[in-house]
C-alpha cells in the first residue's frame, strides 16, 4: 500500500518520501544531533559495585546524558512545530485545489505522520526513562563511593591512632631498656667491687684459719674435760625437765596448745577453731608469702577454700596470665584465687574440687571431682581431674583429659583461633570446649544465645550464661 522509504539528504535531515499516484510528497524532518541509541557502549546498565567508576567519569557521563535529554526535548518540539506548519500549508493547498481525492490522501498522510510522531514520542519516552534509570544508578554509585571513602578514612584514622599507640609503647620500652642497661652497668660495677672486697676477705680468712688451726691443737687437749662437763649438764637438764612436766600436769591437766598463726588452706583454718565464713589470710606452702581467700565454713561440712566466684559482673575476668597466676578481684565478691597458689597447694596433698552453679531461673547444680590438681606454671597450669559426680551433668564440662590454661596473652588451647580472646576470660580451653566459668557476665534476659558467656554445657547448653558460679577445694581426707 503506502511505501515509506527512509533516506538521508545532503544536509543530514531525515527525508520521508510518499508516492501516491502521479503525486509525490516529500517531508524533511530535523535530525536528533546528539541522541545515541541505548545499545551504545557509552551507557552501562550494570551497576559495578565491586569496581565502582571514577567519580569524575560519572559526573561527565551524567552531563552528557543531561545534554542528550535536552536535545531530545528540543527535537520533539521542532518536530511538532514542523508537522503543524506542514499540515497548515498542505491544508491550504488542498483547499485551494479543492481536489477531494487528494484531500483524502492528505488526511491519510497526516494520520501516518501523527502515528509516526506518536511512535517517535514513545521512543523518546523510553530514552528518557533509560536516562533517568542511568541517573539513579549513577547517584547510587556516587553514594557508594562516598560511603566507601568514609570507611577508608575511618580505617586510616584507626590505623594512624594504632600506629601512634605503638610508637608510644615503643618509646616507653626503649626508655625502659635504656634504664635497664644503666642499672645493669651499675650492678656490674658493684659486683666487681664486691668481688675485690671478697678477695681481700679470703686472704684475711686464710690467715685466721691458720691461727685457728693452732688453737684447735690446744683445744683438743681440753676436749675430754669439756665432754665430761657436758655430760653432767645434760643429766641435770633432763632431771629438771622431768620435774617441770610432773609439776605442770599436776597443776593444769589441759595445757593450751599454741594457736597456729599461718594456715595453708581453709581446712586448716576450720580445724584451728575458726568456723565462721569469711576472708582469711593463707600462706603459700613452704613460704611466708600470703594470699587472701574466702573460706566457706558452712557448706558440706565447711573447710572449703574458694578459688573462683562469679555473682554480679562487678569484676572484669578478661585478665592477663600474670593476674590469673597471682589472683585478682574481691575475695568477698567476685575473684580468682590464683593459679600459682592452687598449683602449689594441690601438689602437696590430694584435693577435691566442687563447682557450684546457679541459673537465672532459681535452679542450682554442682559437679564434684574426687581428685583435682594443677600442674606447675612450666606446664601452663594444666588441669587434672578424676571421678565426676553431681547434678550438673553426667559428662564433665571441663574437657578430659585436662587442657593447659589460656589467657588473652597466653594462648595454649587446641584451636587455631585464640579461645581466650574470642570467648573472653582465662580457662582450660580445648578447641574451645564445653565450659568457661570466667566468660563475660550477662545479666538476666540477656543471658541466652551468648557464645562468650559463663558456660557449663552439660548442664545448661552452649548459649546459656549462668547467674553465679563458685569453685572450691578441700583436702580429700577432711
Amino acid at each position: 500500500y503506502n511505501n515509506f522509504r527512509k533516506s538521508m539528504d545532503s544536509i543530514g535531515k531525515k527525508q520521508y518520501q510518499v508516492q501516491h499516484g502521479s503525486c509525490s510528497y516529500t517531508f524533511l524532518l530535523p535530525e536528533m544531533d546528539n541522541c545515541r541509541s541505548s545499545s551504545s557502549p557509552y551507557v552501562s546498565n550494570a551497576v559495578q559495585r565491586d569496581a565502582p567508576l571514577e567519580y569524575d567519569d560519572s559526573v561527565q557521563r551524567l552531563q552528557v546524558l543531561e545534554n542528550i535529554m535536552e536535545n531530545n526535548t528540543q527535537w520533539l518540539m521542532k518536530l511538532e512545530n514542523y508537522i503543524q506548519d506542514n499540515m497548515k500549508k498542505e491544508m491550504v493547498e488542498i483547499q485551494q485545489n479543492a481536489v477531494q481525492n487528494q484531500t483524502a490522501v492528505m488526511i491519510e498522510i497526516g494520520t501516518n505522520l501523527l502515528n509516526q510522531t506518536a511512535e517517535q514520542t514513545r521512543k523518546l519516552t523510553d530514552v528518557e526513562a533509560q536516562v533517568l534509570n542511568q541517573t539513579t544508578r549513577l547517584e547510587l554509585q556516587l553514594l557508594e563511593h562516598s560511603l566507601s571513602t568514609n570507611k577508608l578514612e575511618k580505617q586510616i584514622l584507626d590505623q594512624t591512632s594504632e600506629i601512634n599507640k605503638l610508637q608510644d609503647k615503643n618509646s616507653f620500652l626503649e626508655k625502659k631498656v635504656l634504664a635497664m642497661e644503666d642499672k645493669h652497668i651499675i650492678q656490674l660495677q658493684s659486683i666487681k667491687e664486691e668481688k675485690d672486697q671478697l678477695q681481700v676477705l679470703v686472704s684475711k680468712q686464710n690467715s685466721i684459719i691458720e691461727e685457728l688451726e693452732k688453737k684447735i691443737v690446744t683445744a683438743t687437749v681440753n676436749n675430754s674435760v669439756l665432754q665430761k662437763q657436758q655430760h653432767d649438764l645434760m643429766e641435770t637438764v633432763n632431771n629438771l625437765l622431768t620435774m617441770m612436766s610432773t609439776s605442770n600436769s599436776a597443776k593444769d591437766p589441759t595445757v593450751a596448745k599454741e594457736e597456729q598463726i599461718s594456715f595453708r588452706d581453709c581446712a586448716e583454718v576450720f580445724k584451728s577453731g575458726h568456723t565462721t565464713n569469711g576472708i582469711y589470710t593463707l600462706t603459700f606452702p613452704n613460704s611466708t608469702e600470703e594470699i587472701k581467700a574466702y573460706c566457706d565454713m558452712e557448706a558440706g561440712g565447711g573447710g572449703w577454700t574458694i578459688i573462683q566466684r562469679r555473682e554480679d559482673g562487678s569484676v572484669d575476668f578478661q585478665r592477663t596470665w600474670k593476674e590469673y597466676k597471682v589472683g585478682f578481684g574481691n575475695p568477698s565478691g567476685e575473684y580468682w584465687l590464683g593459679n600459682e597458689f592452687v598449683s602449689q597447694l594441690t601438689n602437696q596433698q590430694r584435693y577435691v574440687l566442687k563447682i557450684h552453679l546457679k541459673d537465672w531461673e532459681g535452679n542450682e547444680a554442682y559437679s564434684l571431682y574426687e581428685h583435682f590438681y594443677l600442674s606447675s606454671e612450666e606446664l601452663n597450669y594444666r588441669i587434672h581431674l578424676k571421678g565426676l559426680t553431681g547434678t550438673a551433668g553426667k559428662i564433665s564440662s571441663i574437657s578430659q583429659p585436662g587442657n593447659d590454661f589460656s589467657t588473652k596473652d597466653g594462648d595454649n588451647d587446641k584451636c587455631i583461633c585464640k579461645c581466650s580472646q574470642m570467648l573472653t576470660g582465662g580457662w582450660w580451653f580445648d578447641a574451645c570446649g564445653p565450659s568457661n566459668l570466667n566468660g563475660m557476665y550477662y545479666p538476666q534476659r540477656q543471658n541466652t544465645n551468648k557464645f562468650n558467656g559463663i558456660k557449663w554445657y552439660y548442664w545448661k547448653g552452649s548459649g546459656y550464661s549462668l547467674k553465679a558460679t563458685t569453685m572450691m577445694i578441700r583436702p580429700a581426707d577432711f
Epitope: 585478665r319 593476674e323 585478682f328 575475695p331 565478691g333 575473684y335
Partner: antibody, heavy 121, light 108 residues
Framework: QVQLVESGGGVVQPGRSLRLSCAAS????????MHWVRQAPGKGLEWVSL????????YYADSVKGRFTISRDNSKNTLYLQMNSLRAEDTAVYYC??????????????WGQGTLVTVSS | EIVLTQSPGTLSLSPGERATLSCRAS???????LAWFQQKPGQAPRLLIY???NRATGIPDRFSGSGSGTDFTLTISRLEPEDFAVYYC?????????FGGGTKVEIK
C-alpha cells in the same frame, strides 16, 4: 605485728612543698597496695591516693591531682607522698593505710597513727 | 564518683540499746565493695565490716552489716561503752575511693 609509722608532717606556707613518709613492717610490703587518707580537723575521712604493690599504677583524688605524687621504695619498705603547691584546705592529719594484696580488691585493714600537716601563712 | 550519704549525722543512745546506721550511695554498686570503719577521738580508723556483711578479724558479733545496691546498714545489736565513736561507710571498688560523711554515736 603489722606496723605503719608516718613522718614528715609539720607547718608549711601555702604554695610550698612537703614530703611525707610511711615506714612499714610486719608484713610483705612489696605484695600490698598502699593508700594515703587524710582527715581535716573536726571533719570526715577523705581518700587521697593509692599505689599498686609494684608501683605500676597510681590513683589520685581530684582535689590533689597534679599537685601530689605517691611513690614507694619496696627495698626500704617505705611509702611516700610528695605534696607540692600546698593550699590551706590541705591542712589535715595524713594517714598511711595498707591496701589491696596484689591484684585483689580489699579495704584498708591496717592504718598508721597519722601525721599532721598544717598549711598556714 | 560514687557519693555516700550517711544518716543520721548524730545518734544519741544509751548503752544496751540497738543502733542502726544508714549509708546510701548515689549509684548502685556491688555490695562486695562496701566497708564500715569505726573511729574514736585521736585514733586511726579501724575496719569493722567488709563486703557489706563480713566481720573483720577480732570484731565482736554484735556488729553486723547488710544491704545491697544503693542502701547499706550497719547494726550494733547492744551498745557497749566502747562502741561510742564515729562510724564511716566506705566504697573501695573504683577510683576515686569514697567515704561517707560519718555518723557519730554518742551517749544519751
Amino acid at each position: 605485728q603489722v606496723q605503719l609509722v608516718e613522718s614528715g608532717g609539720g607547718v608549711v606556707q601555702p604554695g610550698r612543698s612537703l614530703r611525707l613518709s610511711c615506714a612499714a613492717s610486719g608484713f610483705t610490703f612489696s605484695s600490698y597496695g598502699m593508700h594515703w587518707v587524710r582527715q581535716a580537723p573536726g571533719k570526715g575521712l577523705e581518700w587521697v591516693s593509692l599505689i599498686w604493690y609494684a608501683g605500676s599504677n597510681k590513683y589520685y583524688a581530684d582535689s590533689v591531682k597534679g599537685r601530689f605524687t605517691i611513690s614507694r621504695d619496696n627495698s626500704k619498705n617505705t611509702l611516700y607522698l610528695q605534696m607540692n603547691s600546698l593550699r590551706a584546705e590541705d591542712t589535715a592529719v595524713y594517714y598511711c593505710a595498707r591496701g589491696p594484696l596484689r591484684y585483689f580488691d580489699w579495704p584498708s585493714d591496717y592504718w598508721g597513727q597519722g601525721t599532721l600537716v598544717t598549711v598556714s601563712s | 564518683e560514687i557519693v555516700l550519704t550517711q544518716s543520721p549525722g548524730t545518734l544519741s543512745l544509751s548503752p544496751g540499746e540497738r543502733a542502726t546506721l544508714s549509708c546510701r550511695a548515689s549509684q548502685s554498686f556491688s555490695s562486695s565493695y562496701l566497708a564500715w570503719f569505726q573511729q574514736k577521738p585521736g585514733q586511726a580508723p579501724r575496719l569493722l565490716i567488709y563486703g557489706a556483711s563480713n566481720r573483720a578479724t577480732g570484731i565482736p558479733d554484735r556488729f553486723s552489716g547488710s544491704g545491697s545496691g544503693t542502701d547499706f546498714t550497719l547494726t550494733i545489736s547492744r551498745l557497749e561503752p566502747e562502741d561510742f565513736a564515729v562510724y564511716y561507710c566506705h566504697h573501695f571498688g573504683t577510683s576515686p575511693l569514697t567515704f561517707g560523711g560519718g555518723t557519730k554515736v554518742e551517749i544519751k
